[in-house]
């Protein structure tokens, strides 16, 4: 081992405070002690230390605990967080929601990088599940958090943490995550009323299934034209035009502007047109009068 | 136990200088940046100055700067405040401190009054 | 005009709990960590609150301080006639070079 350097006389530090930010780097190693260091880690981050500083008592505390730092140390890292690699988190095992809620406001305002991904992912790991409050605190910092999970991972959400969900941190959800999520707030909004009800489960409807979309249709529930669009392709075309009308309420009008689109445009090729035209908007393309519609689903599922 | 002492005050005449000094005794001088603070009768507490262990670095108020020199012997243990130009509004106790980011320690301040 | 922000004066009965705010900007407290000073009446300040949150040695835990953004605050609590005194904030500014204070809040208990 290469031969540390000695401090020199008087500069031993008894404790960590701003006179450290004067230390050269092989003074801050020689002259800090790596115990005193991790017993006093919640005055790092209010002394302004340089990042080549940082990087010096990260050795310090790599060289006191190789097999990962202790939770103790990890809720007062601070900036020396930004310091860590995924490996080095990855020795971890946070189990404090306080501890994460620490380290994620030293991120905030940042793009989830890579250390808080590992993090987050050993925290979640650690807990089981993704209960309502640790879902709570991560979508607080990262709204997108939910739709980054792969649908086997959504399947550990309880349904009582959907009750922290908002509109937004759904927004970037595709349908095979909603697939995940519509089952379960369905049933964490279960004893609601039905105007309270739809406005909780509103943004979870692009997991809905056809028979769903049915019942809200007898429920004036006024849906607005971008929830329409979110839905199902396969859960709309079987729907009616009259149960469309009821779903939409005053918001019909709106599928002129998206016939070209799905899944209005689906949708469209799959009614009467006599049907269409009894909303009045000069909705076209739907099947002629006369011709007989063959549903060839149901026929293969007789045969 | 830490102290520090400062001496060098008094009556001085608008335009003229002063040098206050400050002795230091109970920890290692030379590992700790020093502040000189202020503060007008009746008033609140102004920064006036900071200096780092090695004196690598000098800090000023814009009120001061150009008109005072902060120094330090670390041989000797003792701060100075070199003001020159002094006027009127730099009536006030001049404290010096330890450290320059949270001043642990305080003396208990010398007076400096500028009149003619 | 003081660059960080205090209430000039706070008051309350003995044993009631007081909070002093202080208000700066990204620059200072947002950036940095705040101390605060107690100055009795005659005397030299004395540091009562370092790194934020901290107590020095024999400062009483009644004393607490806190830091949230660009504002902190610091909590007397059990008020006493001995606490009467001016309470001074401050913290480092990088943009300025210095240490700034806040214009000191008067604490009378009554």
């Known amino acids: 081992e290469v031969e540390k350097t000695a401090c020199p006389s008087g500069k031993k530090a008894r404790e960590i405070d701003e006179s450290l930010i004067f230390y050269k780097k092989w003074e801050l190693e020689a002259c800090v002690d790596a115990a005193l260091l991790a017993t006093q880690m919640d005055r790092v981050n209010a002394i302004p230390f340089t990042y080549e500083q940082l990087d010096v008592l990260k050795h310090k505390l790599d060289e006191l605990y190789p097999q990962g730092y202790p939770e103790s140390v990890i809720q007062h890292l601070g900036y020396l967080f930004l310091k860590m690699s995924p490996e080095d988190i990855r020795k971890w095992n946070v189990t404090s929601l306080e501890t994460l809620k620490a380290l994620l406001e030293v991120n905030k305002g940042h793009e989830m990088s890579p250390q808080v991904a590992t993090l987050i992912d050993r925290f979640v790991k650690g807990r089981g599940q993704l209960d309502k409050d640790t879902l709570d605190t991560l979508t607080a910092f990262y709204p997108g958090y939910l739709c980054s999970l792969s649908p086997e991972e959504l399947s550990s959400v309880p349904p009582s943490s959907i009750w922290a969900v908002r509109p937004q941190d759904l927004d970037t959800c595709d349908p095979r995550q909603l697939d995940v999520l519509y089952p379960k707030a369905r049933l964490a909004f279960q004893n609601m009323n039905g105007s309270e009800y739809f406005v909780k489960i509103q943004s979870f409807l692009g997991g809905a299934p056809t028979e769903d979309l049915k019942a809200l249709s007898q429920q004036n529930v006024s849906m607005d034209l971008a929830t329409f669009m979110k839905l199902r392709t396969d859960a709309v075309l079987p729907l009616t035009v009259a149960e469309v009308q009821k779903l939409l309420g005053p918001h019909v009008e709106g599928l002129k502007a998206e016939e070209r689109h799905r899944p209005v445009r689906d949708w469209i090729l799959r009614q009467r047109q006599d049907d269409l035209d009894t909303l009045g908007l000069g909705l076209q393309g739907g099947i002629p009068n006369g011709y007989l519609v063959l549903d060839l689903s149901m026929q293969e599922a007789l045969s | 136990e830490v102290q520090l002492l400062e001496s060098g005050g008094g009556l001085v005449q608008p335009g003229g200088s002063l040098r206050l000094s400050c002795a230091a005794s109970?920890?290692?001088?030379?590992?700790?940046?020093m502040s000189w603070v202020r503060q007008a009768p009746g008033k609140g507490l102004e920064w006036v100055s900071g200096i780092p262990p090695d004196s690598g670095s000098k800090y000023y108020a814009d009120s001061v700067r150009g008109r005072f020199t902060v120094s330090r012997d670390n041989s000797k243990n003792t701060l100075y405040l070199q003001m020159n130009s002094l006027r009127a509004e730099d009536t006030a106790v001049y404290y010096c401190a330890k450290n320059m980011l949270s001043f642990d320690y305080w003396g208990q301040g010398t007076l400096v009054t500028v009149s003619s | 005009q003081s660059v960080l922000t205090q209430p000039p004066s706070a008051s309350g009965t003995p044993g009631q709990r007081v909070t002093i705010s202080c208000t700066g900007s990204?620059?200072?407290?947002?950036?940095?960590?705040v101390s605060w000073y107690q100055q009795l009446p005659g005397t030299a300040p004395k540091l009562l609150i370092y790194y934020n949150s901290k107590r020095p040695s024999g400062v009483p835990d009644r004393f607490s301080g806190s830091k949230s953004g660009t504002s902190a605050s610091l909590a007397i609590s059990g008020l006493r006639s001995e606490d009467e005194a001016d309470y001074y904030c401050g913290s480092w500014d990088p943009s300025l070079n210095g240490y700034v204070f806040g214009g000191g809040t008067k604490v009378t208990v009554l």
């Open positions: 109970g920890f290692t001088f030379s590992n700790y940046a």
């Open positions: 990204s620059s200072n407290i947002g950036s940095n960590a």
